[in-house]
């Protein structure tokens, strides 16, 4: 028996359906035994065994065309390696298997944003943005008065009166010394391949000490 797959690394968004492709290309056995294993953090569970869908796929998966596995309403917990194993006792090569790595992408939820309400001129200020659910891990962008901020204020002449650095991986926006022009309405957007989400606008006021 020999197997192939039309896609060994399928990527799907949460709550969609996906087909894990496992195709017998040649076999002399009319009724080969099909098994599907799910491997997550080295742990194994069978999701198709003894001709039954089982485990956490029970009720939301089926076998298509003898060997492929279709999963509906995919959840983030379905992200795993799946082994399609076929045993054909009458064949010269009795066993074949293929590994399929399923990635389930999850849209970001509304990020938690922390913006200082009031900062004195010349002082440092840090704005935080964090999102906990997105997969792959989201990238963050900050906006002031609906204008996107670059990762470094020095890279854009429009922001020459500002002095900040944005880490798009951690969501942290750091002003080394705030200017009056840095006052405004701030919000953050967390985005990945599955979608994006933004937090509510929050005002940061920059005030003179005198």
């Amino acid at each position: 028996v020999n197997l192939k797959s039309s896609n060994r690394t399928p990527v799907v968004q949460e709550f969609e359906s996906v087909e894990l492709s496992c195709i017998i290309t040649d076999s002399q056995t009319s009724d080969p035994r099909i098994e599907w294993k799910k491997i997550q953090d080295e742990q194994t569970t069978y999701v198709f065994f003894d001709n039954k869908i089982q485990g956490d796929l029970a009720g939301r998966a089926e076998i298509l065309g003898k060997t492929s596995l279709k999963i509906w309403n995919v959840t983030r917990r379905d992200s795993a390696l799946y082994r399609c194993e076929v045993v054909a006792r009458n064949d010269r090569k009795e066993i074949d298997e293929i590994v399929i790595e399923l990635t389930v992408q999850v849209k970001p939820v509304t990020p938690v944003c922390r913006v200082p309400k009031a900062v004195p001129v010349g002082k440092m200020a840090t704005l935080h943005c964090q999102e906990s659910e997105g997969h792959p891990r989201p990238h963050y962008s900050w906006y002031r008065n609906d204008v996107p901020l670059p990762t470094d204020s020095r890279a854009n002449p429009r922001f020459r009166n500002s002095s900040f650095h944005l880490n798009s991986e951690t969501g942290t926006l750091v002003f080394t010394a705030v200017h009056k022009d840095d006052s405004g309405q701030y919000y953050c957007i967390a985005s990945n391949d599955a979608g994006s989400a933004r937090c509510e606008e929050q005002e940061m006021e920059v005030y003179d000490l005198n």
Epitope: E42, Q43, T44, F49, E97, V99
Partner: antibody, heavy 115, light 106 residues
Framework: QVQLQQSGAELVKPGSSVKISCKAS????????MHWIKQQPGNGLEWIGW????????RYNQKFNGKATLTADKSSSTAHMQLGSLTSEDSAVYFC????????WGQGVMVTVSS | DIQMTQSPSFLSASVGDRVTITCKAS??????LNWYQQKLGEAPKRLIY???SLQTGIPSRFSGSGSGTDYTLTISSLQPEDVATYFC?????????FGGGTKLEI
């Protein structure tokens, strides 16, 4: 922490059989494949097969079909391998190892086949 | 069955050297390759899994790379305790198979 404790060394006669064991601790025994591997000096490492203790399913390297029999006892979290019709070619160190990605190994059992 | 050809089979290097061991598979193994270290009289210890992921507790001087049929284990700065035999192992499909081993001495 994960531990795989294997039984002691065996000196056995040609034609006889031997059963070696691998007691697992520090993890859920029924949730991980258990692999068995043979190591002979000069011959490197050979994969014998695996058993999934959760349902007793096994898979063998065709080379060891009829030579090795893998079993698992859930109540004692112990995997066993029986080797039959022993010859000098079966003299080796045998390891059990855990998981699809074969992460943790037992310390090995030396089996010597000699008359 | 997938054959794993490992080279060199023997390697002598000095402390601080950068050391590279390679494994070539007879067909694409889709990065399902581990590297193990085995010291005399001990069980193999997993260093790298799935081509390039470092096993917890293993020093960062060990790294892995590769894809398709060609894979590499690199020790960036050899230490005296790295004297051992190193094996690659494919778990992509069929009977799992090992490379022939590389005996590393200082």
């Amino acid at each position: 922490q994960v531990q795989l404790q294997q039984s002691g060394a065996e000196l056995v006669k040609p034609g006889s059989s031997v059963k070696i064991s691998c007691k697992a601790s520090g993890y859920t025994f029924t949730s991980y494949d258990m692999h068995w591997i043979k190591q002979q000096p000069g011959n490197g490492l050979e994969w014998i097969g695996w058993i999934y203790p959760g349902n007793g399913n096994t898979r063998y390297n065709q080379k060891f079909n009829g030579k090795a029999t893998l079993t698992a006892d859930k109540s004692s979290s112990t995997a066993h391998m029986q080797l039959g019709s022993l010859t000098s070619e079966d003299s080796a160190v045998y390891f059990c190892a855990r998981g699809d990605g074969v992460d943790y190994w037992g310390q090995g059992v030396m089996v010597t086949v000699s008359s | 069955d997938i054959q794993m050809t490992q080279s060199p089979s023997f390697l002598s290097a000095s402390v601080g050297d950068r050391v590279t061991i390679t494994c070539k598979a007879s067909q694409n193994i889709n990065k399902y390759l581990n590297w193990y270290q085995q010291k005399l009289g001990e069980a193999p210890k997993r260093l790298i899994y799935k081509t390039n992921s470092l096993q917890t507790g293993i020093p960062s001087r060990f790294s892995g790379s590769g894809s398709g049929t060609d894979y590499t284990l690199t020790i960036s700065s050899l230490q005296p305790e790295d004297v051992a035999t190193y094996f690659c192992f494919q778990y992509n499909s069929g009977p799992r198979t090992f490379g022939g081993g590389t005996k590393l001495e200082i």
